[in-house]
């Protein structure tokens, strides 16, 4: 194996770095961009989709969770399969699963089917990161591997920018919708979901023009196929550099003898499904065996260390980046509540209300023979009030409640004042006629504040760019470990600044700082993961670690967001501790700079 690694490195040096790698860079970049988009889709559509699908808080939470769950399963599944079936083939299948279900999710109406489609879409895209980095690394010579893998990371950021820009451009346009009958509605947020499937679709199209990794062929004893691909790399680069006359000098390459080739069954043995069943079981066994070998004596220490680093990095990064917008919303809510107007003991008779009431509390009021027509109630509370001989028509409300109120001889026509909005209230001889249909839940809706999140995400993802460039340029100069540990320490320090963020703009600025600093850790971690494992375990290990990363993300998000409105100290302390632990673990890993790809 060592001999193969050395020879392969020499061949890649002969092939050079040129047009072939840059073409592959953009193709795989699209696949990585699709992953960057996926993380944001659900978060961006929730403010609009919650009304359409009538989502409760638990439904919304489940929708956010399901994407990570899908990506977790996908990373492990496709990562394991890519070491057995090939990088290109598995990436094509996983992206196809992603784009098909992302496409379907744009059209399905029910919450359950939307959830299912997003789950499978997540399973599909889960294969992107583990396969893309392994695949690209196998076309890169040692000299610039770290730098070019880091440039590839930039596409994840581009995916986030694309998602935020598209959300900003599409979702607020309610006009971009149509209705078929009374049941089928296609609103602008669905157009956004559809547009978010484009990177994946384009990646599939572009990937069909690319060859399989020659290193995978060699690991599986396919010498001729590997030679053909390497010749293609050489010839493409030489033609582009203006040396078409240069001949690919390699004639023979070492190959690994395959011991556990897929079991082949005679076609006359049993039914087709039995044959496929045996093949699937055999393949599953090999994938599982390969995964367990990552915990074998040779790799156990590395795997456990990497698990620690991936977990702590993900826990703090995802925890904080989801906690930020929640914290901003909390600050907005606190500010909004501070501006609430209170009207005590008012007595109103024979008055017609036909305007908007917002952010008010009416206490101990008496309303006689009043008409509330075409009224918009936004964050209004009526407490201990009496409504007698009143008439409500065409009233729409959000975050509005009637607490301990009494209604006598009152008529409600075409309102959305559903039962739960009357808390400990008495209705005497009162009638509800033609209540508004649709979602009976109070949804936060799609006000300016809801769209603000697109802009914040846009800024936050864009802020990663300087960190990405710096880390790419320094990756091969200072080494992966210094980059990882240094960036983690800087992230840890930037975490403490969060304590001083008491305004919306300060929090956004700190989000950008944290994202910009921590990206270098992610880049270093991706490069390290690729280089620490041999080619026959590379995507399996990467897939497993990426699955663990998604689990850590879910835990981080759950724990951090539970402190919103309670304390800022706990999430900052958790994140700092995790980052400190991660950087100390990272320093115990072996440096891979200057090594040939095993």
């Amino acid at each position: 194996r060592e001999e193969l690694a050395q020879q392969y490195e020499a061949i890649l040096r002969e092939c050079g770095h040129g047009r072939f790698q840059w073409t592959l860079y953009f193709v795989l970049g699209l696949a990585l961009m699709a992953d960057g988009v996926e993380v944001f889709v659900v978060g961006f559509v929730l403010p609009s989709a919650e009304k359409d699908m009538c989502l409760s808080d638990s439904n919304k939470g489940m929708l956010g969770l399901i994407v990570y769950l899908g990506m977790m399963v996908g990373a492990f599944l496709w990562g394991g399969l890519a070491d057995r079936l090939g990088r290109r083939q598995c990436l094509l299948i996983s992206l196809s699963v992603n784009s098909v279900f992302a496409f379907f999710s744009s059209f399905v109406q029910g919450y359950g089917t939307f959830l299912f489609c997003r789950l499978l879409s997540g399973v599909g895209i889960g294969g992107s990161i583990p396969i893309v980095f392994s695949y690209f690394s196998e076309f890169l010579a040692q000299e610039k591997r770290g730098e070019h893998l880091s440039w590839l990371c930039m596409f994840w950021m581009i995916g986030g920018v694309y998602a935020a820009a598209m959300a900003w451009a599409i979702i607020p346009h309610y006009g971009w919708s149509f209705q078929m009958g009374s049941a089928y509605q296609f609103h602008s947020w669905r157009v956004f979901v559809l547009v978010c499937a484009f990177p994946s679709v384009f990646a599939i199209g572009a990937l069909t023009t690319q060859p399989e990794s020659p290193r995978f062929f060699l690991e599986n004893g396919k010498h001729d196929e590997a030679w053909m691909v390497l010749k293609q790399v050489h010839d493409t680069n030489m033609r582009a550099k203006g040396h078409p006359e240069r001949v690919f000098s390699v004639t023979h390459i070492k190959t690994i003898h395959q011991e556990d080739e897929l079991i082949e069954i005679q076609s006359d043995t049993g039914a087709w499904y039995q044959r496929w069943g045996v093949r699937a079981l055999s393949l599953g066994g090999q994938v599982w065996g390969n995964f367990l070998s990552c915990f074998g004596p040779e790799y156990r220490r590395i795997t456990l260390m990497m698990m620690g680093v991936w977990f702590t990095m993900s826990f703090s990064y995802y925890g904080l980046t989801v906690w930020f917008p929640d914290m901003i919303r909390h600050l907005q809510a606190v500010d909004y509540a501070a501006r609430t107007k209170v009207f005590p003991g008012e007595r109103v008779e024979h008055v017609t209300f036909n305007f908007t009431l917002e952010n008010q509390i009416h206490r101990g009021g008496q309303y006689f023979n009043d008409k509330f027509i075409g009224l918009r109630l936004k964050s209004v509370s009526f407490e201990d009030s009496l409504f007698e001989e009143c008439y409500f028509e065409d009233v729409t409300s959000s975050n509005t409640f009637f607490r301990n109120c009494t209604f006598i001889n009152t008529v409600f026509y075409n309102t959305d004042l559903f039962e739960y909005k009357f808390v400990n209230s008495r209705l005497v001889n009162s009638t509800f006629l033609h209540n508004k249909e649709g979602c009976p839940l109070d949804v936060t809706g799609t006000g300016e504040g809801a769209y603000m999140v697109y802009f914040v995400s846009f800024l936050g993802t864009l802020a990663v760019l300087p960190g990405n460039i710096v880390s790419a340029l320094l990756m091969d100069k200072i080494g992966r470990l210094r980059m990882l540990a240094g960036s983690s320490v800087m992230s840890c320090v930037s975490c403490f600044f969060l304590s001083f963020g008491n305004s919306e703009s300060a929090m956004i600025a700190l989000l950008c700082l944290f994202g910009g600093v921590s990206i270098a850790s992610w880049n270093a971690l991706d490069v390290l993961t690729v280089e620490l494992y041999p080619s026959d375990k590379r995507t399996t290990a990467f897939g497993f670690l990426n699955a663990l990363c998604k689990l850590a993300a879910v835990l981080g998000i759950s724990i951090f967001t539970s402190f919103v409105g309670i304390t800022k100290a706990a999430p900052i302390l958790f994140a700092s501790a995790a980052l400190a632990l991660g950087s100390s673990l990272a320093l115990k890993l072996p440096e891979t700079r200057g090594q040939v790809l095993q």
Partner: nanobody, 119 residues
Framework: QVQLVESGGGLVQPGGSLRLSCAAS????????MGWYRQAPGEQRESVAS???????TYADSVKGRFTISRDNAKNTVALQMNSLKPEDTAVYYC?????????????WGQGTQVTVPP
């Protein structure tokens, strides 16, 4: 006191049409809303369609595109044109009205008219 009288119910084949009418009489002050509810055997009364002053209409999702409500404010009458009828439209249809009197809103109901669409 206001009286509401419905007419036009009957038996109609699936896919057929029917027109229900309702006339209000008595001391009407300001007839703000007129509309229709229906009640199938063993079911709760459900909203069908209504029309408020200013020709603002509301329809239940189940009848949108098939039923049309119209109103003559001068005569205080309301009509419901029902097309593409289905067996699930079988019910007693009740006319209702909301009169905004000097003393507050008053809701009035008709006796109901039977509509049957055999399966």
């Amino acid at each position: 006191q206001v009286q509401l009288v419905e007419s036009g119910g009957g038996l109609v084949q699936p896919g057929g049409s029917l027109r229900l009418s309702c006339a209000a009489s008595g001391s009407i002050f300001n007839m703000r809303v007129m509309g229709w509810y229906r009640q199938a055997p063993g079911e709760q009364r459900e909203s069908v369609a209504s029309m408020a002053s200013g020709d603002k209409t509301t329809y239940a999702d189940s009848v949108k595109g098939r039923f049309t409500i119209s109103r003559d404010n001068a005569k205080n009458t309301v009509a419901l044109q029902m097309n593409s009828l289905k067996p699930e439209d079988t019910a007693v249809y009740y006319c209702h009205a909301v009169d905004l009197t000097r003393n507050g809103p008053r809701v009035y109901w008709g006796q109901g008219t039977q509509v049957t669409v055999p399966p």
